[in-house]
Amino acid sequence: FSPLRRISIKILVHSLFSMLIMCTILTNCIFMTMNNPPDWTKNVEYTFTGIYTFESLVKILARGFCVGEFTFLRDPWNWLDFVVIVFAYLTEFVNLGNVSALRTFRVLRALKTISVIPGLKTIVGALIQSVKKLSDVMILTVFCLSVFALIGLQLFMGNLKHKCFRNSLENNETLESIMNTLESEEDFRKYFYYLEGSKDALLCGFSTDSGQCPEGYTCVKIGRNPDYGYTSFDTFSWAFLALFRLMTQDYWENLYQQTLRAAGKTYMIFFVVVIFLGSFYLINLILAVVAMAYEEQNQ
C-alpha cells in the first residue's frame, strides 16, 4: 500500500472521523432548518461540502473507486454520499436555471446520518428487505383491489351522479336548458336539493331500498360526482381509488353512505366483504410480512 492509502485507511477506521462526520451532518441539518439564513451561512455551506468531499476522498483512497469488490461505489450507502457531493457542486458552480429544484437534493444530506449510525443502518436494511418480501403481498393486494374495483364498476357506475332535482320548473325550462346555464354553487342550490351544511346535492336512487327525494323533487342522473368529482365508480381508476380508500379506511363511512343511498341498502354486503378482506386481512398480512422481515434481519 502507498503511504497515502495507509493514512487514508487509518483516518477511515478512526472513531473520531466518524464522530466528525456525524457532527457535521447534524450541524448541517440544523442550518437547513433556518428560515432566512444570514449571509455568513454560505461560507458554512462551503465548509460542509468540503468536509463531505474530504470524507469521500478518504474513502476512495482507502478502498479504491469502483474496480474492486469492496471499493467506494460498490457500497450503496456511498452512492448517497456521491450524489450529495455531485449536487453540492452542481448547484454552486453550474448555472442550471431552476436551482431551487436542485437545492431540494440538499435534504439528502440528512440521510447520510443513516450510513453513520450503525443501529439505524440495520433498521433501514431491514426495511429494504421487508419491501423486497412485500412484493408478493403487494401483487395480491393490487389483484384483490382490482377485482373489487371491477365489481364496484359494474355495480355502481354512474350511481353517484343521481341527484334530487326540483320538479316545479318554469314553463319554458328543461333539464338540459338548466344544466347549460348553471354556473355558480347558488344556481345549483336553486334546482337541486341540498341538506343543510352539505356541499353536494342530495343523492338518491331508483331502487326501492335506495334514498328517496323529498316532496317536490325527483331523482335524475345529471352533473358531476360528489366531492368535486373525485368520488365515483365511473371508471376503473376511480373505482380502484375508492377501493383503496375502503382498504385504508380513509373516511370510508362517507363513501359507504353515499353509495348505499344511490344504489340501495342491499349493497352493504359488498362493503362488508371489502372491509373484512381488504382492510382487516390484507393490511394485517402486510404488517405480518414487515414483522417477519425485521425478525429475520435481527437474527
Epitope: N159, F165, L169, T174, L175, G216, T218, V220
Partner: nanobody, 124 residues
Framework: EVQLVESGGGVVQPGGSLRLSCAAS????????MRWYRQAPGKQREFVAR???????GYADSVKGRFTISRDQAKNTVYLQMNSLRPEDTALYYC??????????????????WGQGTLVTVSS
C-alpha cells in the same frame, strides 16, 4: 330508447270536450314532470299544463278552470282533459317529460323527451 306517444286528438265543436293522453315507453325508471304544450299554426309553442311525480299541477292562465291534467304512475301516462273548448284552442298538442331510463349497455340516463304531437281542431 324512450318514446312519448300522444293520442286523443281530433275535430270537436266549440264548447265540446276531448281527452288527450301521452304514454311513455321504454326502460323507464322514473318520470319527473310531464307537461303539455301547444303550437297553433304560425305561432310560437306555448305551455298548457304540467304535473310532477308527486302530482303537483300547474296551468297556463288561458286554460285554467277548463283543462285538467292527471297522470297514471303505473302506466307512465299523462292525461289532459279539455272541456269548454274554444276555436283558439286549435293547435298541435305536444307532450314533454323528464325521464330517467335505463339505456343501451345498462347505463342510466336522465333527459327531456318530446312526443310527435296530436292535432286538436275546434271548429263549427
Amino acid at each position: 330508447e324512450v318514446q312519448l306517444v300522444e293520442s286523443g286528438g281530433g275535430v270537436v265543436q266549440p264548447g265540446g270536450s276531448l281527452r288527450l293522453s301521452c304514454a311513455a315507453s321504454g326502460r323507464i325508471l322514473r318520470i319527473g314532470y310531464m307537461r303539455w304544450y301547444r303550437q297553433a299554426p304560425g305561432k310560437q309553442r306555448e305551455f298548457v299544463a304540467r304535473i310532477t311525480d308527486d302530482s303537483a299541477t300547474g296551468y297556463a292562465d288561458s286554460v285554467k278552470g277548463r283543462f285538467t291534467i292527471s297522470r297514471d304512475q303505473a302506466k307512465n301516462t299523462v292525461y289532459l282533459q279539455m272541456n269548454s273548448l274554444r276555436p283558439e284552442d286549435t293547435a298541435l298538442y305536444y307532450c314533454e317529460a323528464l325521464v330517467t331510463a335505463s339505456v343501451r349497455g345498462g347505463s342510466i340516463h336522465s333527459g327531456t323527451y318530446w312526443g310527435q304531437g296530436t292535432l286538436v281542431t275546434v271548429s263549427s
